[in-house]
Every structure is written in C-alpha cells, then in structure tokens.
Amino acid sequence: DMKGHFDPAKCRYALGMQDRTIPDSDISASSSWSDSTAARHSRLESSDGDGAWCPAGSVFPKEEEYLQVDLQRLHLVALVGTQGRHAGGLGKEFSRSYRLRYSRDGRRWMDWKDRWGQEVISGNEDPEGVVLKDLGPPMVARLVRFYPRADRVMSVCLRVELYGCLWRDGLLSYTAPVGQTMYLSEAVYLNDSTYDGHTMGGLQYGGLGQLADGVVGLDDFRKSQELRVWPGYDYVGWSNHSFSSGYVEMEFEFDRLRAFQAMQVHCNNMHTLGARLPGGVECRFRRGPAMAWEGEPMRHNLGGNLGDPRARAVSVPLGGRVARFLQCRFLFAGPWLLFSEISFISDVVNNSSPALGGTFPPAPWWPPGPPPTNFSSLELEPRGQQPVAKAEGSPTA
C-alpha cells in the first residue's frame, strides 16, 4: 500500500471554470472572433456573451488556435469536459475533436498523448452536450491549452472544464535512465511510456511519467490494470547487467524547498522472473541546481521478507532533510529493478519561494497572499466541487 499516496480515482474535482473560481484573467486565447466570443466566455455550462469562445481564425488545416487556462499552481489534471456554443440554444458551432498541450513553467509545452501515443481527442457531436474525456495518463500542469480541430473550413467554438486536484507532491521532474525491455517468452516493455520530458543518450530528464501517475503495478509485472496495453506497461525497469556501478541513479526536482520525511517506492519482487526489491537506497540532498550536495547521504538498507514475491511499497526514511533536489541510488539485489511509482512525503519549508516564480511575471506561482506553509503532500484541498464520478472506460472516455 502506498500509504498516503494520492489516488488518481479521487483526484477528479472541478477546478473552477464553471463555478468561476478560475478568474477571467486566467483564461486567454490565441484569438477571438469578437469580444462576445472572447476567452472568458469559455466556461462549461455558461451562456455568457455569445455562448462560448470562438477563435478568429480557421482551425483547418493549421490547428493553431487555442484556448488557455492558467491554474496558477501545479495540478494533476485527470479529466476535461467540452461543450460547443450555447447562443440561447441556437448555436451550431462545436468541435468534433481537439488536442491538448500543457506546461508546468510557461516555457516548455508538451503535447498530451494517450497511452498509445494518440494526441487527438474525440470532442462534441452537438453544441449543448458535455463530453467528458478521461485523461489516461493524467497531466501535471499549471497551464492547459485546448486546440480545437476540424476536417474542413468551418466555425468551431468551445466551452470547457478541467477536473483534477492540486499537485501536492511538488515534484516537477525526475531524471532516470531509459527503461529497458526484458526478454522472457515474450518481450516485456519496461520503458516509461508516458514520460513527458526529454530523452537523450540513455537518459530521460526534465519531465514526469509513469513513476508519478498514481498507478501502482500488479504482483505479476507482465499484467496491467490498464486495458489493451503491452506486457510490463505499469513498470519501469532496468537490468543490472546495464549498470557497471551496481545501482540505478535517479534525480528528483521539486517546486520549492521542502523537508523530506520519506520516499515511497512501489517495487516489484517477482524474483522467479528476476525482479527484486532494491538491496538498499542512498539519497543525497541539495537546495539548488548548481549547489553542492549537502551533508552525508541518507542510507537505508532494505530488510523485510524478500522471499515474498508480491509487489509492495518500500518506505525510505529521509530524516526531514531540507532540499529542492534529491539524487537517489537504488542498489541492485537481483537481475532487475522494477518500479511502478515513486512518491514523497514532505512539508514545504516556511517562506521558501517557488522555484519557478517569475518565469512568467504577470502571474505569481501562488495565489495572492502568503503561500500555505507546512502542508502535507497528502492533502487534496479541492478547488471546486465534488469529484466527478466517471471512470476511465466510461462511454464518454
């Protein structure tokens, strides 16, 4: 059990388009047909103005027009809802499909893709119906852009809502070696297939992926709770033969200075097929990207019932060490290390300024007033309503 780890099934609160917790000033667009179809009129179920946001330009064939929502803080966005133009019930404009892009810092934008690499999302079939789309995988974002699409020159308009929860973990990115394929009777693909950073020279850096999506793997790593995915999907894995050093090294970057109580790593231990819990973990800490690693590393040897083949969460105490960057080495105790999730229990250090504050000056990282202090990474604190009770695989997904 990943004690205290966020549950993606419960992270489905409306984030504030419909109920106006997201102010007009945080909604913008590439263009608008007129002031009455400006970005601020893009709230789900709203009939403001002419009933939706409508771009000035055609979305065919270029697909360059977008509606942008700034959530002001990092959120896990698990679900989106779209509608067409209301116009007193006379509107005929809607978007049959769209793409999403998202950013955590306002500088680097990523395309949302589903688990099979598809970017295009099925949208609306009429102007009034709300179509909900489960985002599998969910995205960790501060800014989200909707790019409506069309298959011919036509008018498209959008109203939207986003659903999710505050990203309390504070994890901005992790860096890790590329996951590898295990060759059994069939190939088991242990790559991080939803990683949204860069991949170069055997290293993935600057992004988040399956190790931070809230989904823990099964005891048998060849199987998955996801439908229609390949063997090994839930896990990221590395062969000890690939690491002369005897360990896999990962680095974690956080939004601000935090006091780290523990790291939880969900590991596979199907030792009959070579997967073993790490023999130990060693973590180093530093406060800034160019600063020296501080003090002695925290070392934790793993005991417990290593013969039990069940997957489990391993808790690594971090002793309240203060840092914004962690580098952890996971020691091989067998042929393979397989992780499905890594999360952190931490508290924001009082008055620490956000790492990315000022990267786009008009909007502070935190809402006006002092940032919350000493919150646990486990709270949800929904911004809007109750969770939307739709699950992946529902007819609207």
Epitope: Q180, L190, G201, S242, S245, E249
Partner: antibody, heavy 121, light 107 residues
Framework: QVQLVESGGRVVQPGRSLRLSCTAS????????MLWVRQAPGKGLEWIGT???????YYASWAKGRFTISRDNSKNTLYLQMNSLRAEDTAVYYC???????????????WGQGTLVTVSS | DIQMTQSPSSVSASVGDRVTITCQAS??????LAWYQQKPGKAPKLLIS???DLASGVPSRFSGSGSGTDFTLTISSLQPEDFATYYC?????????FGGGTKVEIK
C-alpha cells in the same frame, strides 16, 4: 549537423604525452555517455574508456593510470590525455556517442572519423 | 573484467549465403549486447543494440539473438555490401569491451 570530429593525432616519441580532442556539433556532449575506442593497424576495436553525463569515468584495465578522459562543456569537447606512450599505442583513435535503441539498451550510434596516433622514435 | 570472444575470426561466403557469427561473454551480460559493421578505412556502424533491436536504416536481413553469455548475429542472405568485419560489444553504462571481430570475406 550532428557529428563528432577528432583531432590531435600525430607522430610522437615513446614516453611522451599527447592529448586528443573530440569536438561535438549539433548536440550537447554532457547529455551523453561518451567513449574512446582505438584500433591498431590491422587489428580489432579496443575500448579505452567512458565518461558518463555525471562525469564518472570508466577505463579498461590496461588504460588505468596512463589514460584520462575529460570534457569541457563550454567548448563541447571531449578529451583523451595519453601519457607514457608506447609503440603498441599506435592506432586510429575514435570517439563515439552512446544512445539507446527502442528497447532501452545502449549502442554507439555516432562515431567520429578517427585520428591516427603513431608512437615511434 | 568481462571478456568478449567472437568466432569464427573469419568466414568465407558467397552472395546469398546465410552467415552466422557468434559472440560469447565470460559471464552473463543479460541482453546488454550490440553489434557493429566496419569496412576498411571507415568508422564502425551500429547494426543492433540490446541483442535484437535493429538500428535505424539497417536492413532486415540482419538479426540478433541470444541472452546471458551466448549471442548470435545472423545475415540471412549475404549481399555484396555486407563483406566487412563485424564486432560484438558488451555496452552497459560503464565498461564496454569489444569482441575480437569476425571478417566476412568473399569466397
């Protein structure tokens, strides 16, 4: 254009030192594991050493102590410092970049053209 | 240190022949093996990484197999441009020894 260009190879007397350079263009050296490999005339490929993106170095047992790999990120250049050179160090020296294939395993996907070092009195 | 041993050191074959080259590691290396082709006066060219994975642009007549300590490179139907020397390499994040090479010559 993504490429590696070695330089610094020449005729050198036994016992002397020599530094080879490998300049990268089209990518950042510090994002990759970089290797030096050599090939004596008419012989096979011989791994000399590797530098990781974290600047950890690994050497073949025969190269430890005499050969040193380093890099200058500002110049995007990899170096091989060779000391106490011997006749048997005569070879073409290559630098190469390690990348992962679709299955996550490394291979040397990019090589320089090589530079010839001749150790002779 | 791990040693890589290739056999045969040379093989004579004709166009259209099936050619098999083997590589043996002194201890288990899992699937951490790459194969290269080198022609005289040229730098080596990556053919396969991770035992099986063909590098971009490599023809499908090349294939790799094996795991642990014993590995094979197969050319299913030798073409004129395939006459060259082939090397295996254990290539982890760290030490990376090559095999001694196998020269494929025209019969």
């Amino acid at each position: 254009q993504v490429q590696l260009v070695e330089s610094g190879g020449r005729v050198v007397q036994p016992g002397r030192s020599l530094r080879l350079s490998c300049t990268a263009s089209g990518f950042s050296l510090n994002r990759y594991y970089m290797l030096w490999v050599r090939q004596a005339p008419g012989k096979g490929l011989e791994w000399i050493g590797t530098i990781s993106y974290g600047d950890t170095t690994y050497y073949a047992s025969w190269a430890k102590g005499r050969f040193t790999i380093s890099r200058d990120n500002s110049k995007n250049t990899l170096y091989l410092q060779m000391n106490s050179l011997r006749a048997e160090d005569t070879a073409v020296y290559y630098c190469a970049r390690a990348d992962t294939g679709d299955n996550g395993y490394l291979g040397l996907q990019l090589w320089g053209q090589g530079t010839l070092v001749t150790v002779s009195s | 240190d791990i040693q890589m041993t290739q056999s045969p050191s040379s093989v004579s074959a004709s166009v259209g022949d099936r050619v098999t080259i083997t590589c043996q590691a002194s201890q288990s290396i899992g699937s951490v093996l790459a194969w290269y082709q080198q022609k005289p006066g040229k730098a080596p060219k990556l053919l396969i990484s991770g035992v099986f994975d063909l590098a971009s642009g490599v023809p499908s007549r090349f294939s790799g197999s094996g795991s642990g300590t014993d590995f094979t490179l197969t050319i299913s139907s030798l073409q004129p441009e395939d006459f060259a020397t082939y090397y295996c390499q254990y290539i982890p994040y760290g030490s990376s020894p090559f095999g001694g090479g196998t020269k494929v010559e025209i019969k």
